[in-house]
């Protein structure tokens, strides 16, 4: 029942792992139903070493997994949203359209 895709573990350094918190800091509610309004810490890797990680997508840090993932823009996929999905036509399709 577990499916994992496009996830990268940021390198752990000691000071980071010692900085545990009782609760992630929340943004004010609102926007996108308030979902993902949490979790905007100074140590968010998406704002540091992973800020340019997602080529055609949005970097997201998942605290539970201590991992970074990319939410790709439409038509892009891959670990870093660097691959574009191409719509291909078969030989039959192209011959029918002539």
């Amino acid at each position: 029942s577990v499916r994992v895709e496009q996830v990268v573990k940021p390198p752990q350094n000691k000071t980071e792992s010692e900085n545990t918190s009782d609760k992630p800091k929340r943004k004010k509610k609102g926007g996108k139903n308030g979902k993902n309004r949490r979790n905007r810490k100074k140590k968010n890797p998406c704002n540091a070493e992973f800020q340019n990680f997602c080529i055609h997508g949005e970097c997201k840090y998942i605290e539970h997994l201590e991992a970074v993932t990319c939410k790709c823009q439409q038509e892009y996929f891959g670990e870093r949203c660097g691959e574009k999905s191409m719509k291909t036509h078969s030989m039959i399709d192209s011959s029918l359209s002539k």
């Epitope: 996830v7 992630p24 308030g34 997201k60």
Partner: antibody, heavy 125, light 112 residues
């Protein structure tokens, strides 16, 4: 086969301390966030604490914050809950639970997919 | 905090009949068309068991008479044809990334 086995429960006086343990087996422990959930006698489920895969992030409800501390030892496949300043209202069966998850298209969906049998904590003078 | 409220508190249904349990959240648990809502079954003397995750996905091994539906703030667990072994307490739980990770108060399902 995934197994979670809690231990450390018992009778303790108000203001006392107790340390619960959860021994995990049958899965890659350091790939999953883990939680403690409790259930007072005859009552519903109450989330108590969560810890991230490597222990860098911990979460608590206001009811236990400052009194309870969750930790994990990935080398020993073990989860812990240190409970201090215990109160009568902390009396409950404490369950250890694994966070199963789906991660796709930038979305993270999680749920408690495996639970231990629980350990009873009784706080009474 | 997101508050989860289940209805009814208890329910008696005849064997073979449909059972419906509702769960309402104090604010939306949806994001971009995804619902962050799970259902659990707890039989007497046992730990809870995951039935449905992400509102409508049945956990492996769960009989297909169990189904989940809904979005936003309103969700439903349906048992299409009640069996004797379905007698239990059922809980909904929101699994947004926002703690506290709250449960509903539970619905006790019995046989009429």
């Amino acid at each position: 086969e995934v197994q979670l086995v809690e231990s450390g429960g018992g009778l303790v006086k108000p203001g006392g301390s107790l340390r619960l343990s959860c021994a995990a087996s049958g899965f890659t422990f350091n790939s999953y966030a883990m939680s403690w959930v409790r259930q007072a006698p005859g009552k519903g489920l109450e989330w108590v604490s969560t810890i991230s895969t490597g222990g860098s992030h911990t979460y608590y409800p206001d009811s236990v914050k400052g009194r309870f501390t969750i930790s994990r030892d990935n080398a020993k496949n073990s989860l812990y809950l240190q409970m201090n300043s215990l109160r009568a209202e902390d009396t409950a069966v404490y369950y250890c639970a694994r966070h199963g998850y789906l991660l796709y298209d930038g979305y993270y969906e999680w749920y408690f997919d495996y639970w231990g049998q629980g350990t009873l904590v009784t706080v009474s003078s | 905090d997101i508050v989860m409220t289940q209805s009814p508190d208890s329910l008696a249904v005849s064997l073979g009949e449909r059972a419906t349990i509702n769960c309402k959240s104090s604010q939306s648990v949806d994001y971009d068309g995804h619902s962050f809502l799970n259902w659990y079954q707890q039989k007497p003397g046992q730990p809870p068991k995951l039935l449905i995750y992400a509102a409508s996905n049945r956990e492996s091994g769960v009989p297909d008479r169990f189904s989940g539906s809904g979005s936003g703030t309103d969700f439903t667990l349906t048992i299409s044809s009640l069996q004797a072994e379905d007698v239990a307490v059922y809980y909904c739980q929101q699994s947004t990334e926002d703690p506290p990770y709250t449960f509903g108060q539970g619905t006790k399902l019995e046989i009429k």
